[in-house]
Amino acid sequence: QPPPPPPDATCHQVRSFFQRLQPGLKWVPETPVPGSDLQVCLPKGPTCCSRKMEEKYQLTARLNMEQLLQSASMELKFLIIQNAAVFQEAFEIVVRHAKNYTNAMFKNNYPSLTPQAFEFVGEFFTDVSLYILGSDINVDDMVNELFDSLFPVIYTQLMNPGLPDSALDINECLRGARRDLKVFGNFPKLIMTQVSKSLQVTRIFLQALNLGIEVINTTDHLKFSKDCGRMLTRMWYCSYCQGLMMVKPCGGYCNVVMQGCMAGVVEIDKYWREYILSLEELVNGMYRIYDMENVLLGLFSTIHDSIQYVQKNAGKLTTTIGKLCAHSQQRQYR
Amino acid sequence: SAYYPEDLFIDKKVLKVAHVEHEETLSSRRRELIQKLKSFISFYSALPGYICSHSPVAENDTLCWNGQELVERYSQKAARNGMKNQFNLHELKMKGPEPVVSQIIDKLKHINQLLRTMSMPKGRVLDKNLDEEGFESGDCGDDEDECIGGSGDGMIKVKNQLRFLAELAYDLDVDDAPGNSQQATPKDNEISTFHN
């Protein structure tokens, strides 16, 4: 480091150092002045600082602080932003694969049910995607709609393929019968349980990551108070007013000042810790029916089983439905 | 063995795909994220110290600035500074957080509540409210596959996590469902999303 300079009788060095921040020299005294108007860098004797310089220092100090805070949170912010994007995309890919699995199952096992089945499956998985992204959709309704839509097609194409076209307006009756007669057994209930649990967890996981980003963004763009600006100015710049161009703040002093400036921000700490630990707990529980990947990629199989269940009970069901929906059919013939 | 759509195909064509080593799974990615986040658990309480360590402070110098004068770095005066005529540091701390900070704390409290509610106790077995005909779900083995429910044909196992990306060399579009084609489609590049 350079040797300590002799006292400056002309404010020459202060002028040059101030030019690092502010081009031009009109704010810097030619020679030391009493500085009675200073509010932050209170002089013990003549000073080379003016009120205007103090104001510039305070403004710069607060900007410095904002930049320091942003650089401190950069890595954390990037971590959460990147992962939120990756997981959102991953979940979308899982949904797309689950839809394709289900469509492939229909195409290869029940070709007569396509293309209607594709349409219902597509609508179901669109709702799944929307739900994950926070849409106000009821999962039970989504599952019910899928089975309500599928059953009339299964009944008319698989169970009763000889049904005349004129009788095809019994759909409403068939939709009602689907629930009343538990046509698919407990499979819809099973799917509801699994899908709702896995999607709820997925949705809250994404919500939590997005809130994490919001927390960092909020603290990243905090505007520091004037009091804080004064404390920082005194720590970083007031030494210049005394011609001390090379000294650095004491470590303990810096900590005291930063704790004062950060008092509000540090209050987040308790809740931030809890956030990370709660998120960890959630992640630890994301398996089996709490893992949407596991659940959605197995849906085709459960749906396949549910259709087999219907086929197994086809004889009994056809008779019952024949009676139950006879009125609808008769109405069509008139 | 995993129960996959290709097992259901009428022509029973089964796609053979080379085993992909070290494939990244969603589950492992989640755990990795948590581990990284945990290294930031003290982020807010450590901020004042972090900022001091990234701004100029006297380390090797004998003398340092305490806001009023040059002092010996290890003297009592080094941390005690002349703030009394200026503004009270205690008052500054007592002012409480800004409204935006209070709002974000409320949001954190809310999400923490939700996360706690959603967190499931470990090792919980699946709901057994299945079919009247006695369909039941039992526990799966300790292998990496997880069961998602049962059927008359026995336990359905689904390959857990994004292994399906490795084992299916293409997107199962209806137009090129397995059986119709065994070619990889350009959509494969989306798989790389899950790798660092």
């Epitope: 101030f18 410095n64 030494s239 | 990234h54 701004s55 100029p56």
Partner: nanobody, 120 residues
Framework: QVQLVESGGGLVQPGGSLRLSCAAS????????MSWVRQAPGKGLEWVSA????????NYVDSVKGRFTVSRDNSKNTLYLQMNRLRAEDTAVYYC?????????????WGQGTLVTVSS
């Protein structure tokens, strides 16, 4: 550990030119703003010039504007000060200094300096 080593100083006649270099190591040079500071014999420190990490932004004290040019080569981790039309009052020890993240605040690190003497 951070090291800044200046070189290129010497005796030069008024009106002459010199190019100072500062070799940096121990930190990410390309992301650090750098400054040149000088100290004339028996005088205080005077800030001379600064340059941003990318080299895209420069700043000079009024007394050297138009005569001195600061530049950097991030691939070589080196800072330069091209001094033209030198005057007797430019005689000083020239230090290169690493700027801290506090703009206009105390420097993080200094070199040991190189002496420039302008005399006929």
């Amino acid at each position: 550990q951070v090291q800044l080593v200046e070189s290129g100083g010497g005796l030069v006649q008024p009106g002459g030119s010199l190019r100072l270099s500062c070799a940096a190591s121990g930190f990410t040079f390309s992301s650090s703003a750098m400054s040149w500071v000088r100290q004339a014999p028996g005088k205080g420190l005077e800030w001379v010039s600064a340059i941003s990490g990318s080299g895209g932004s420069t700043n000079y004290v009024d007394s050297v504007k138009g005569r001195f040019t600061v530049s950097r080569d991030n691939s070589k981790n080196t800072l330069y000060l091209q001094m033209n039309r030198l005057r007797a009052e430019d005689t000083a020890v020239y230090y290169c200094a690493k700027e801290s993240m506090v703009r206009g605040g105390p420097f993080d690190y200094w070199g040991q300096g190189t002496l420039v003497t302008v005399s006929s």
